[in-house]
């Protein structure tokens, strides 16, 4: 249940458009887990690329790029009757407002590729 | 290049811990694309579960849960020599500060499952 049942939801139209945000992250170390090697062991493996932007918070985001057009079979060969596709997620980041140097930001949506999965084409069409 | 080259990076230790954030999202409709059906067509299919929390912004986040332990083969059977695993990503959300109803939040890290991928087990051991 909400801690403040009388508070308007932050997505309501009547909610203040500018809010104060504390950058001391909660759960900083919660959920920390050893780096997964799924990107190598997947049938739709991917590479991870560093996307850096000093005007953004967080300034570094890692993006996945599928290695193959098809998927890797049990023998290590690429099967082009299947597709390696990026799994994408919309995330929120903070973008520094250009006119206010130190402490003014704006929420921004980013579409990031988190990893890849192997899917069956709807239309099987190979030249 | 940074819009404000003299500005400290928001991740620097000397950066103000409390900042102003405009909730009018930039890129609200950017990258909007037709809803993907990969969750059904994947060899490691998943279901999407709604995670709702009125004290969080965004209040609704969709979480993926892999349907199978193994992966679906070309004939539609589950192959238990492979594993369906969740692809997870750490995201930032805004958590309402309990003592300040209207416009005070704190950044919080969340680990969310975005989708599933099919991986080769490290140890092939089936009872």
């Amino acid at each position: 249940s909400p801690q403040n049942p009388g508070c308007p939801n932050a997505e309501d139209k009547n909610f203040p458009r500018t809010v104060m945000v504390n950058l001391n992250i909660r759960n900083r170390n919660t959920n920390s887990k050893r780096a997964s090697d799924y990107y190598n062991r997947s049938s739709s493996p991917w590479n991870l690329h560093r996307n850096e932007d000093p005007e953004r918070y967080p300034s570094v985001i890692w993006e996945a790029k599928c290695r193959h057009l098809g998927c890797v079979d049990a023998d290590g060969n690429v099967d082009y009757h299947m597709n390696s596709v990026p799994i994408q997620q919309e995330i929120l980041v903070l973008r520094r407002e250009p006119r206010h140097c130190t402490n003014s930001f704006r929420l921004e949506k980013m579409l990031v590729s988190v990893g890849c999965t192997c899917v069956t084409p709807i239309v099987r069409h190979v030249a | 290049s940074p819009q404000n080259p003299g500005c400290p990076n928001a991740e620097d230790k000397n950066f103000p811990r409390t900042v102003m954030v405009n909730l009018n999202i930039r890129n609200r409709n950017t990258n909007s694309k037709r809803a993907s059906d990969y969750y059904n067509r994947s060899s490691s299919p998943w279901n999407l579960h709604r995670n709702e929390d009125p004290e969080r912004y965004p209040s609704v986040i969709w979480e993926a849960k892999c349907r199978h332990l193994g992966c679906v083969d070309a004939d539609g059977n589950v192959d238990y020599h492979m594993n369906s695993v969740p692809i997870q990503q750490e995201i930032l959300v805004l958590r309402r500060e309990p003592r300040h109803c209207t416009n005070s939040f704190r950044l919080e890290k969340m680990l969310v499952s975005v989708g599933c991928t099919c991986v080769t087990p490290i140890v092939r051991h089936v009872a």
Epitope: C66, R67, L69, V85, H125 | -
Partner: nanobody, 125 residues
Framework: EVQLVESGGRLVQAGGSLRLSCAAS????????MGWFRQAPGKEREFVAA????????AYTDFVRGRFTISRDDARNTVYLHMTSLKPEDTAVYYC??????????????????WGQGTQVTVSS
């Protein structure tokens, strides 16, 4: 949104070589697998080659395999098609395209949403 502009097409003798370039504008260029297609006069547009998002994997149609090479340089936002041992039947307008959907396999033309205006390649005998 991605805009694609091809260049490098010209008249060349049979047996010669060409390198086509496809320059992309738009920050999301690196998010897409890319492909080259071609259309000869009076014929349908057909698949030539494709390259994965990371550039690690490529695929070709049978009639160019071993003669053409597709590559990408994400730092320059450019995709290339290096064509060797050209034949008169390679004469066509060559189009670069970005694959944004995965309803079919890599050569399925409807999966490519963004297209350039094309560059003319003419191979004389």
């Amino acid at each position: 949104e991605v805009q694609l502009v091809e260049s490098g097409g010209r008249l060349v003798q049979a047996g010669g070589s060409l390198r086509l370039s496809c320059a992309a504008s738009g920050r999301t260029f690196t998010s897409y697998p890319m492909g080259w297609f071609r259309q000869a006069p009076g014929k349908e547009r057909e698949f030539v080659a494709a390259i994965s998002m990371s550039g690690d994997d490529t695929a070709y149609t049978d009639f160019v395999r071993g003669r053409f090479t597709i590559s990408r340089d994400d730092a320059r936002n450019t995709v290339y098609l290096h064509m060797t041992s050209l034949k008169p039947e390679d004469t066509a307008v060559y189009y670069c395209a970005a694959r944004t959907s995965y309803d079919g396999t890599y050569d399925y033309i409807d999966d490519y949403s963004y297209w350039g205006q094309g560059t003319q390649v003419t191979v004389s005998s």
